[in-house]
Structure formats: C-alpha cells, structure tokens
C-alpha cells in the first residue's frame, strides 16, 4: 500500500564546472527506508545509500560525486553531458519502491560572465 510521496528538487539548472545538489524526500508514510539508489538518465547507477552498509559511489563517478546532504547527492565539476534526468529510488518496508525524478540542465557560462572574467582593470 503506497501512501507516501516523493518530493524532489524538480527541474534545476547549474553552471558548467559548478556543482549541484540532487535531493529527494519521502513523506507521508511510516515506511522504513532500507536503501536509496541514484541513477542517471541512461540508467547507470551513480550511487547507493544502504541503511546497513552506508554509501557506495560507483567507480565511474567517484571523482565527481559526493554523498549527501542526507540521502541526497552532490554532483561536482559539471559538464554539458550531465544534462538530463536523474532518478532517486527509495526501497522501503513495507511499502516497496518509490521513485522520484529530477531534470538537471547544465548551462554554459554566459558571454557576459566570460568576458567580464577577462577584463583588464
């Protein structure tokens, strides 16, 4: 019986080279969270947070992904290729699986910012 709801950060944007926090929150349920999986748009696993074993960051993302805050994930050194959907999957007892979606758009630094950075005083 799925009584809970997943709240996410929704559609977010961040600058290339910067970082972003991906956050999901499960509410309106007494269910116990046993594991949270974070997946990228191509279904590749970024990280798992297991209640027993703690965090596991997958090797391909070790340099750019930091666990937290909470059950969320911090994505660093963003590239244009990071644009796309991200999914959090909550494995809970006794409700089963809940899934949340976040869309991340990575933006190029604006021309104004770019030129300002190279202005000669």
């Amino acid at each position: 019986m799925m009584t809970g709801t997943i709240e996410t950060t929704g559609n977010i944007s961040a600058k290339k080279g910067g970082s972003v926090i991906l956050q999901c929150h499960l509410s309106s349920t007494m269910a116990q969270v046993t594991q949270v999986n974070w997946e990228q748009h191509d279904h590749s696993l970024l990280a798992i947070r297991n209640a027993e074993l703690g965090w596991h960051i997958y090797p391909a993302f070790k340099d750019r992904v930091a666990p937290g805050p909470g059950l969320g994930l911090t994505l660093q050194s963003l590239t244009m290729n990071d644009t796309g959907e991200y999914f959090c999957t909550y494995h809970t007892y006794p409700d089963g699986t809940y899934r949340g979606r976040i869309f991340l758009e990575v933006l190029e630094s604006s021309v104004a910012e770019h030129s300002a950075r190279f202005q000669i005083p």
């Epitope: 019986m1 799925m2 007494m30 269910a31 116990q32 969270v33 046993t34 594991q35 297991n50 209640a51 027993e52 494995h91 809970t92 007892y93 006794p94 409700d95 089963g96 699986t97």
Partner: antibody, heavy 119, light 108 residues
Framework: QVQLVQSGSELKKPGASVKVSCKAS????????LNWVRQAPGQGLEWMGW????????TYVQGFTGRFVFSLDTSVSTAYLQISSLKAEDTAVYYC????????????WGQGTTVTVSS | EIVLTQSPGTLFLSPGERATLSCRAS???????LVWYQQKPGQAPRLLIY???TRATGIPDRFSGSGSGTDFTLTIRRLEPEDFALYYC?????????FGQGTKLEIN
C-alpha cells in the same frame, strides 16, 4: 550469520503481562523493520504489525491495539513484544521477523516464543 | 482487507511428483507484492518466493512462483521428501498484510 533469537516459553495466568524479546545478530537492528506474527495452536499465521527500528514508531493491525506494545532497545539490538491483561485466547506462538525490501517480504524469522495463558 | 484463499487445503502427492499450489486474492495485489513461505512442524516459517516470482536466497530452483493480479501459483517441480510441509502466501499490496490459511502438502 543474520539471525533473530527469541526468549523462551512463558506460562502466565489470565490478567498477567508478558514481555517477549527478539535479539538481532549478524546485522544492525536499526537498518531493517521488525515484524511480529502470531500463530495460535493449530492455526495459520497472523500479521500483528511492525516497528520502524529507525524511528521506533510502531504500527499495529486492528485487533492488536491497546494490549499489545512493540518496543526496542537498540543498545542491546533487541525488539520486544509486551502483552498486558492476558487472556486465554492469547495462547500462541509469537514470531519476530525482519522486514526486507524491495519487494517487501519477511526474510529472517526468530524461532518463535510460546506463550501459554492458563489459570 | 484483502482475503487470500489457498487451495487445495491439503494436497496428497508422492516424492518426484509436481505440486501446484494456488493463492487467490479477493482483490488485485498491487505490484504483485505476493510472498510464499514454507513451515514445518515446530519450526518458524521460511521465505521461499517474494514479488510473486523471485526465489529467496538459498531456495532450490525446483521452487517457482508465478501469477499476477488476483491469481498466484507456487510450483514445486520434483518433490523431495523435505518439501512436505505447510505453505502460506502473504500479500503486501494493501494493509493489513494478510496471509492465506495455508496448504498442507502431505505424502501420499
């Protein structure tokens, strides 16, 4: 290995209370939910409810409210079932079982505790 | 609440034969969250199948689960002497998470 070890059999008089313990080993008690299941003599299994071992929040099935209390002592990795104002119809084997997900199931069971209520 | 009806109540078979146990729900079990347990006299139940068709760790492949919606089946392909026991289904589709009344598998 992962196991749940329950306290021994109890013989109680009507009106008395009993506290059944369920000790978890081989895993962290607070990482998985803990269920209680009753089996009356010669009868089937009856799910009594469960306790969120992370928050300590219990959920009771209708028919197991009031006289039944689920609790935890995480310092000794133990869950408890307390039954007060015992009646003859409480005579049963009581099992604790770990809740696992996903999909949900009870994957590890205690050996059961027989509670006999008789005058 | 969802009522689970198991049939037959008792099944008489011989070792080597195939056993087919049925579990019928009074309403559809959400996401096929149906579980099968085995119980032997004087012992705790043992998890066999979850999610209607996934075998639990250490369960021999002669055990298989199938079905969806309201009709579920546990099949034991070639019965071994140790398979003669009680079998219960349980649903996690809707609280309270009810059990069936059980099917007793007896040696013919």
């Amino acid at each position: 290995q992962v196991q749940l070890v329950q306290s021994g059999s109890e013989l109680k008089k009507p009106g008395a209370s009993v506290k059944v313990s369920c000790k978890a080993s081989g895993y962290t008690l607070t990482s998985h939910a803990l269920n209680w299941v009753r089996q009356a003599p010669g009868q089937g299994l009856e799910w009594m409810g469960w306790i969120n071992t992370n928050t300590g929040n219990p959920t009771y099935v209708q028919g197991f409210t009031g006289r039944f209390v689920f609790s935890l002592d995480t310092s000794v990795s133990t869950a408890y079932l307390q039954i007060s104002s015992l009646k003859a119809e409480d005579t049963a084997v009581y099992y604790c079982a770990r809740g696992y997900s996903s999909p949900p199931r009870m994957d590890v069971w205690g050996q059961g505790t027989t509670v006999t209520v008789s005058s | 609440e969802i009522v689970l009806t198991q049939s037959p109540g008792t099944l008489f078979l011989s070792p080597g034969e195939r056993a087919t146990l049925s579990c019928r729900a009074s309403q559809s079990v959400s996401r096929n969250y149906l579980v099968w347990y085995q119980q032997k006299p004087g012992q705790a139940p043992r998890l066999l199948i979850y999610g209607a068709s996934t075998r639990a760790t250490g369960i021999p492949d002669r055990f298989s689960g199938s079905g969806s919606g309201t009709d579920f089946t546990l099949t034991i392909r070639r019965l071994e002497p140790e398979d003669f026991a009680l079998y219960y289904c349980q649903q996690y589709g809707s609280s309270p998470f009810t059990f069936g009344q059980g099917t007793k598998l007896e040696i013919n």
